[in-house]
Interface confidence: low
Amino acid sequence: YDFTNCDFEKIKAAYLSTISKDLITYMSGTKSTEFNNTVSCSNRPHCLTEIQSLTFNPTAGCASLAKEMFAMKTKAALAIWCPGYSETQINATQAMKKARKSKVTTNKCLEQVSQLQGLWRRFNRPLLKQQ
């Protein structure tokens, strides 16, 4: 999906009002210094690409993020403020339903959400300082 047509300010507002708090809730009890940020992004469309990938694509050791509150709100924000996004996600949604029935918080998931927090922060302050 090409995220360049999204309404970035509206997505930013959704992040600041709710998504950020849900991410903090998920990470509660975890030290902010526990994980190193290894994923970055260079501008807002790129950040959304990385955010979508980390939030909705199951990875080894963490297949359950899509059912979390922050993920559902992220999906809603992208569906509302990125034209045509919903249509591209129908097949992906079916795959996610099959992938996991229950929510499990693993260390790998905590690390992944820590990366997401960094990506969202970069989304709000875009532009890579070095390519």
Epitope: N5, S42, N43, P126, L127, L128, Q131
Partner: antibody, heavy 117, light 107 residues
Framework: EVQLVQSGAEVKKPGASVKVSCKAS????????MHWVRQAPGQGLEWMGM????????TLIQKFKDRVTMTVDKSTSTAYMELSSLRSEDTAVYYC??????????WGQGTTVTVSS | DIQMTQSPSSLSASVGDRVTITCRAS??????LAWYQQKPGKSPQLLVY???TLAEGVPSRFSGSVSGTQFTLTISSLQPEDFATYYC?????????FGGGTKVEIK
């Protein structure tokens, strides 16, 4: 209304320094990055570097690393670009431009710097 | 560094003509390209960003497109106020670089 107002034209001798200012208004100064771009007479645009007004972190292209200093004064929403050890090839119009995603939606009016002995 | 090769460097056209300017990136920059218009003695003005998004207040006769690493700015029907120099610029990452410019002159 967003405005970037730059300081006036400067005439300098080779070896001297020049400090160009860029006063921002009409938006939250620390939200946008400030970039500096120059244009030699009859030539194209050349990106010099950028500064993040929120934390003053700067990125400069290699050719300017030793001679350019970019600073901001958050209290007055002003960005500065100082170029030292001036030479004749630094004669150009210097622009400040604000950006969030790397494209420039507002530019200053430009400051002409002439280096001549 | 990413090199931006802009062509032609100049062109002559008449009012009402369709004008096409191209810019090629030396590597993949996705849709991270902007187009600017500059008139003599003035600052550049943003026309298009993210390769195809028209900036606020820019007339609809301007449009941008992308195919791989080649980017195109099209003016569908040239107007007297469009005679100027046009620059492309990638905004994929540091260092930002501009194309050499295309001067659109009156035939």
């Amino acid at each position: 209304e967003v405005q970037l107002v730059q300081s006036g034209a400067e005439v300098k001798k080779p070896g001297a320094s020049v400090k160009v200012s860029c006063k921002a208004s009409g938006y939250t100064f620390t939200t946008y990055w400030m970039h500096w771009v120059r244009q030699a007479p009859g030539q194209g645009l050349e990106w010099m570097g950028m500064i993040d007004p929120s934390d003053s972190e700067t990125t400069l292209i290699q050719k300017f690393k030793d001679r350019v200093t970019m600073t901001v004064d958050k209290s007055t929403s002003t960005a500065y670009m100082e170029l030292s050890s001036l030479r004749s090839e630094d004669t150009a119009v210097y622009y400040c431009a604000r950006t969030l995603d790397g494209y420039y939606d507002y530019w200053g009016q430009g400051t002409t710097v002439t280096v001549s002995s | 560094d990413i090199q931006m090769t802009q062509s032609p460097s100049s062109l002559s056209a008449s009012v009402g003509d369709r004008v096409t300017i191209t810019c090629r990136a030396s590597e993949n920059i996705y849709s991270y390209l902007a187009w600017y218009q500059q008139k003599p003695g003035k600052s550049p003005q943003l026309l298009v960003y993210f390769a195809k998004t028209l900036a606020e207040g820019v007339p609809s006769r301007f449009s941008g497109s992308v195919s791989g690493t080649q980017f195109t700015l099209t003016i569908s029907s040239l107007q007297p106020e469009d005679f100027a120099t046009y620059y492309c610029q990638h905004h994929y990452g540091t260092p930002w670089t501009f194309g050499g410019g295309t001067k659109v002159e009156i035939k």
